[in-house]
């Protein structure tokens, strides 16, 4: 009887070892796949939601004409904000016209009220010129209203219906922009 019990115990232990090994393998596999899965899932979700809803923008993004906008719910410094947008296949907001500025400020008023939101505008340290992240110059009516006194790098942000400037290392919300998908219908 004792022998039978110890045999069963050994079998159970062996099973447990095999399960632990399988779990370890799975954990390793999961870890190596996690990064790729994250992006595949995001891509699939965007694709599927677009396919099902014929939606030009991903969920939780706002559409205006050819653009989709995402208003962040977290604060970050300017450079991290840019990285966060890039992760989503977008860039920080680049305001091309007064109409676009009006849409953005109107939407922000409805969504969140009067907070600071980083946009893709920064000031060249040497020349003092303002440039969008793609290297283009903003139109004259879309230059930050006040010059920041910071000795550090200076970046642009939207607040209420104004474009302002601040030390890039301060923490703010941010707005990402990508192109809206064209409807195939």
């Amino acid at each position: 009887k004792l022998l039978q019990v110890s045999t069963i115990a050994m079998q159970q232990q062996e099973k447990l070892i095999q399960q632990e090994r399988a779990l370890l393998n799975f954990t390793e596999w999961k870890r190596s796949c996690a990064l790729q899965m994250k992006y595949c899932q995001a891509f699939m979700q965007n694709s599927l939601s677009s396919a099902h809803n014929s939606s030009p923008c991903p969920n939780n993004w706002i559409q205006n004409r050819e653009s989709c906008y995402y208003v962040s719910e977290i604060w970050s410094i300017w450079h991290t904000s840019q990285e966060n947008c890039l992760k989503e296949g977008s860039t920080l907001l680049q305001i091309e016209s007064k109409e676009e500025m009006d849409f953005i400020t109107g939407s922000l008023r409805k969504i969140k009220g009067s907070y600071d939101y980083w946009v893709g505008l920064s000031q060249d340290g040497h020349s003092g010129r303002w440039l969008w992240q793609d290297g283009s110059s903003p139109s004259p009516g879309l230059l930050p209203a006040e010059r920041s006194q910071s000795a550090n790098q200076v970046c642009g942000y939207v607040k209420s219906n104004s474009l302002l400037s601040s030390n890039c290392s301060t923490w703010k919300y941010f707005i990402c922009e990508k192109y809206a998908l064209r409807s195939s219908v």
């Epitope: 990064l35 790729q36 992006y39 595949c40 995001a42 891509f43 990285e83 966060n84 890039l86 992760k87 989503e88 296949g89 977008s90 860039t91 992240q133 793609d134 290297g135 922009e177 990508k178 192109y179």
Partner: nanobody, 113 residues
Framework: QVQLQESGGGLVQPGGSLRLSCAAS????????MGWYRQAPGKQRELVAA???????AYADSVKGRFTISRDNAKNTVYLQMNSLKPEDTAVYYC???????WGQGTQVTVSS
Amino acid sequence: QVQLQESGGGLVQPGGSLRLSCAASGSFFSINAMGWYRQAPGKQRELVAAITNQGRIAYADSVKGRFTISRDNAKNTVYLQMNSLKPEDTAVYYCGRPGWDYWGQGTQVTVSS
């Protein structure tokens, strides 16, 4: 296994040009964004330029007007054309996807007379 292979680095005089290439294996390439980063000795890795799958572009202030990023989805390759190079551009250049902590072996760019 996804692999990133950077090439095109070298020694160049100030004012010179180089074109870096990054070939990516795997079908992830066309999703979201790809970027060029650089790391100089004793400094943190920094984003130099990035391009999204839609062709939206972002450059670091220090390279605006001098560097141009582009991508060829058919070849799974992203390029960095570097003109008017300066000694402060000396670094190891890596390509990668923003937010995705995976890198190739990098390519050394040295700007010196």
